[in-house]
Interface confidence: low
């Protein structure tokens, strides 16, 4: 007899129990499933998703969830009109509570929230809310994705039809239709105050099976501002028993959440069962790998005007502001080259896609630091001229940031190009992602016995005879005792760190979306004649989780569009909705060879010595290579390795100067995990330690890119 209610798995004596509300009182019973117990399951390991089917046959069905939604294949369904929400604008009562179930954090809704429309067969009542998240710093945690792009958090609201059933549990146990909404949370520079009661609640349910009443919140405020654009498909529960009874409504637009607020999710603990031994671990990566669509059709809503803006507007500007009305994709092929000791030349190519032609001109914006002040200049260049600009009177000890924006009619703008960094008189280059917080041992659990939290440390790693001094800075682990290169997280040259004012101690993390209010000067950096060029880009890849059992496309950036409400997207990458086929067309068009083609997953990665990587002239790269074109994220799912929508295949040499530390403490770090140098072939089975944030750069391979974006001051409107 099935007593299992998938929604509230709670680990009790080795079994997953079901929360059943006692309708005659406020008590909640946890039914312990023993002799007739529902099967234990987990998100990884021996009881992980690939094994769910052995105890829950439906998990092997053909209509499973979650899925990747490819926008271009979604059909507009005329029956999918406006959602009618009832009660969503009311403040929740003080009886609404949150529980750490061990598999998720669930909110038990005690008030009447109803939804109808959207093709739902009747008026459905909201029962509960559940969350799915990644492991740190905005890494991919959503279950669903759009065009391969996953998000840091997915909130799911579950509904049942009270006209048909007296409770949600009955609907589940009867294998009847239920409804579910999926809402993505995207990283934003600022806290989302609507989430405060939820975040506060999370702090009260840190440990498994903890419960807490929630401060009043407005459920509507947890939904996207615009509800008109959504996808619809039929699928399943995303946890055992995976019943294929769910009518999914997946909102296209995300809800903002700050890094600080994300930390509350990453701080939740669970209890895991390993060979009859229970261990307390962080609850992270609590998402099911994506499932095949099979014969299903994904529909999209037919709400008038809801899909007017190109998908880029939400991928890059989740808050859906005026800045989202872009007229083209970004200018590409950004380059900065020194002409002489005091002049630089910036060049670019026209955008690949122009939504609202023609391009009238280009705005070149550059900023630098001088005497502790940040300065910025902007000038225009007609589109019919050479796509180059010369910057004269370059100061030798300033860090310059360049970006270009196309301007169309009616002062419509493109997205910003990659931001290029140029620093004269420096030979050492910081390569890798943003600096992340150190000295927080509790921020990540050890994921295996040979891992332990670190605060900071330094070491030296050598590949092909080239020494790299690095500083360990991570919310995660130090190198594993196995010595695997795959667990090294940020390769940073200590000289440049010192020059930027960083010592060996804890370093503030810096969110990807805020330009430093004061750009770092390089006064104390080593003074040598080489002039490296550093490119950053806003489009970052979210790592897929370790242990994803199906090759889903989650290499797409969870961080695109983490913009301040009024800021333009500065993503230099192509994040429009190209699926694999479109990507490959673009590859052929631009003549770019992707890493996936260049280096088969099972072939060794050559690592030739490259002594003159940053030779005189600054923009020269490895001999025999015209340019380092591609930054490719490690495909954590073992799936595709091409540069997907979140990565620009036309990226130039892409190393990055770390943002300066500021008074503000941010909890973010870049989720991107680029290719690791390795003496052995990178096999499909190789994965990186889940919480590792160390990045090493193989000079012979692709560089990594990070992200810098602009705060309100000096914004180019």
């Amino acid at each position: 007899v099935l007593h299992y209610v998938v929604c509230f798995p709670a680990l009790t004596e080795g079994y997953v129990g079901a929360l059943h509300e006692n309708r005659h009182g406020s008590a909640v019973q946890i039914r312990r499933r023993k002799a007739s117990g529902d099967p234990y399951w987990a998100y990884s390991g021996a009881y992980g998703p690939e094994h769910w089917v052995t105890s829950s046959v439906s998990c092997g069905g053909r209509h499973q969830s979650p899925i990747d939604i490819l926008d271009q294949y979604a059909r507009v369904g005329e029956e999918y009109q406006e959602l009618q929400l009832d009660g969503f604008d009311n403040e929740s009562s003080n009886k609404t509570w949150m529980k750490n179930t061990g598999k998720t954090v669930a909110i038990l809704l005690k008030d009447d929230y109803f939804v109808s429309g959207a093709g739902l067969p009747g008026r459905f009542k909201a029962e509960k809310v559940e969350f799915h998240w990644g492991h740190s710093n905005g890494s991919a945690g959503s279950e669903h994705s759009i065009n391969g792009r996953r998000f840091p958090v997915e909130m799911q609201i579950f509904f049942y039809n009270p006209d048909d059933f007296d409770s949600f549990q009955t609907a589940i146990s009867e294998n009847r239709i239920i409804g579910a909404m999926a809402i993505f949370f995207q990283v934003s520079p600022r806290d989302n105050s609507a989430l405060d009661p939820i975040i506060h609640g999370l702090k009260g349910v840190v440990h498994h099976e903890k419960e807490t009443f929630l401060d009043p919140f407005v459920l509507r405020d947890l939904l996207p501002a615009s509800l008109g654009s959504y996808y619809r498909y039929t699928g399943s529960l995303t946890t055992p028993p995976c019943s294929e009874i769910v009518e999914w409504i997946v909102f296209r637009r995300p809800v903002p959440i700050s890094y600080h607020q994300l930390e509350a999710f990453y701080s939740i603990f669970t209890t895991e069962q390993q060979d009859h031994v229970k261990s307390v671990e962080y609850l992270r990566n609590n998402f099911r790998p994506q499932q095949r669509l099979h014969d299903r059709v994904v529909s999209k809503s037919a709400v008038r005007d809801s899909w007017n803006h190109d998908m880029t507007d939400f991928l890059e500007n989740p808050l859906g502001t005026e800045a989202s009305k872009v007229c083209s994709s970004p200018p590409i092929h950004m380059k900065v080259q020194p002409l002489n000791q005091t002049a630089l030349q910036v060049s670019w190519s026209q955008p690949e896609t122009i939504y609202h032609p023609p391009i009238m001109n280009y705005m070149i914006s550059y900023s630098w630091t001088k005497n502790e002040d940040e300065k910025e200049k902007t000038f225009t260049k007609d589109s019919d001229k050479d796509l180059k600009a010369t910057i004269s009177h370059v100061s030798p000890d300033s860090l310059y940031l360049f970006r270009v924006q196309a301007v169309c009619r009616n002062d419509m703008r493109s997205d910003f190009s990659q931001t290029m960094l140029f620093q004269a008189n420096t030979t050492r280059i910081f390569q890798g992602t943003r600096i992340v917080k150190t000295g927080v041992p509790t921020a990540s659990p050890a994921s295996s016995a040979d891992m332990a939290p670190i605060s900071s440390g330094s070491s030296t790693w050598t590949s092909s005879g080239i020494p790299f001094s690095f500083v360990s800075m991570a919310t995660g682990m130090g190198p594993s005792s196995s010595g695997s290169q795959a667990t090294v997280a940020s390769v940073v040259t200590s000289t440049l760190l010192a020059g930027l004012g960083f010592g060996g101690g804890g370093i503030s993390s810096f969110p990807s979306t805020v330009w430093p209010t004061r750009l770092p000067t390089a006064a104390s950096a080593s003074k040598q004649a080489a002039r490296p060029v550093l490119a950053t880009t806003e489009a970052l890849a979210s790592p897929g989780p370790d242990g994803d059992s199906s090759p889903t496309k989650d290499g797409e950036g969870t961080e695109e569009g983490e913009k301040d409400e009024k800021s333009e997207s500065e993503d230099g990458e192509r994040e429009h909705e190209e699926d694999g086929e479109k990507d490959s067309e673009k590859k052929e068009k631009s003549g770019v060879t992707h890493a996936a083609e260049e280096r088969n997953q099972t072939e060794p990665s050559p690592t030739p010595s490259s002594p003159n990587r940053t030779a005189e002239g600054g923009h020269q790269t490895i001999p025999g290579h015209e340019q380092d074109h591609t930054a490719v994220p490690t495909d954590q799912t073992g799936g595709r390795r091409d540069a997907g929508p979140g990565l620009d295949p036309d990226m130039v040499t892409s190393t990055q100067v770390p943002p300066t530390a500021t008074e503000e403490q941010y909890a973010g770090s870049d989720p991107k995990r680029p290719e690791m140098p390795s003496k052995k072939p990178m096999s499909r089975g190789d994965r990186f330690s889940e919480d590792s944030r160390f990045i090493t750069v193989n000079p012979a391979e692709k560089n990594t890119s990070g992200m810098i974006s602009r705060p309100a001051p000096g914004r180019m409107e």
Epitope: H3, P121, G122, P162, D164
Partner: antibody
């Protein structure tokens, strides 16, 4: 392969109680709602009732009181009382899946009520 | 009570496309499923939730729903498609949950 089979169909006189039993192979009965559907000779399909995973049963209005569905972990039973000639039909045991759909049907067992 | 109405019989030429309908007052709020039954056999599920097809069902069979009418479409009708076709849906609330079958449509394939 997943399948169902019904047992207990036979010739009976009006008023005689009769119990039909359904067993499954290839899947666990306990995970699904199970239903009984009947079809009189030359007529259409007629839903009798459904029993959920937790044992709660739902019946067609005409079947209430005369038909009772029960289940164990391995069987689903249909207990019929006060049978009349118009209850002559092939009785199908059916698995309900996908929400509101009958995806696996047994071959049926014939119940004939005749005096 | 809730009644599903189907045409008693429909004819189609071999290789042609035929649509079988199922109507009810509030069908727009319900999911329809479709079943094929050949003489002497148990019914087989063809379509569930209006449009979804179980694995093993040929893609010649498709379902749709508009307003209070659910439709089963058979494209390229074959002799083996000659059978009775039933639609079904659910109705009711709470403990009065009901499942209802239509009267069935006998499909004849000619030629």
């Amino acid at each position: 392969a997943q399948s169902l089979e019904e047992f207990g169909g036979r010739l009976a006189t009006p008023g005689t109680p009769l119990t039909l039993t359904c067993t499954a192979s290839g899947f666990s009965l306990g995970t699904y709602s199970m239903s009984w559907v009947r079809q009189a000779p030359g007529k259409g399909l007629e839903w009798i009732g459904t029993i959920g995973g937790r044992g709660d049963a739902y019946y067609a209005s005409w079947a209430k009181g005369r038909f009772t569905i029960s289940r164990t972990s391995t069987t689903v039973d249909l207990k019929m009382t006060s049978l009349a000639t118009e209850d002559t039909a092939t009785y199908f045991c059916v698995r309900e899946n996908y929400g509101y759909a009958f995806d696996i049907w047994g071959p049926g067992t014939l119940v004939t009520i005749s005096s | 009570s809730f009644v599903l109405t189907q045409p008693a019989s429909v004819q189609v030429n071999l290789g042609q496309t035929v649509s079988l309908t199922c109507t009810a007052d509030t069908l727009s709020r319900r999911y329809a499923s479709w079943y094929q039954q050949k003489p002497g056999q148990a019914p087989v599920l063809l379509i569930y939730r209006d449009t979804s097809r179980p694995s093993g069902v040929p893609d010649r069979f498709s379902g749709s729903s508009s307003g209070n009418t659910a439709t089963l479409t058979i494209s390229g009708a074959q002799a083996g498609d000659e059978a009775d076709y039933y639609c079904a849906t659910s109705d009711g609330s709470g403990s009065s949950y009901q499942c209802v079958f239509g009267g069935g449509t006998q499909l004849t394939v000619t030629g």
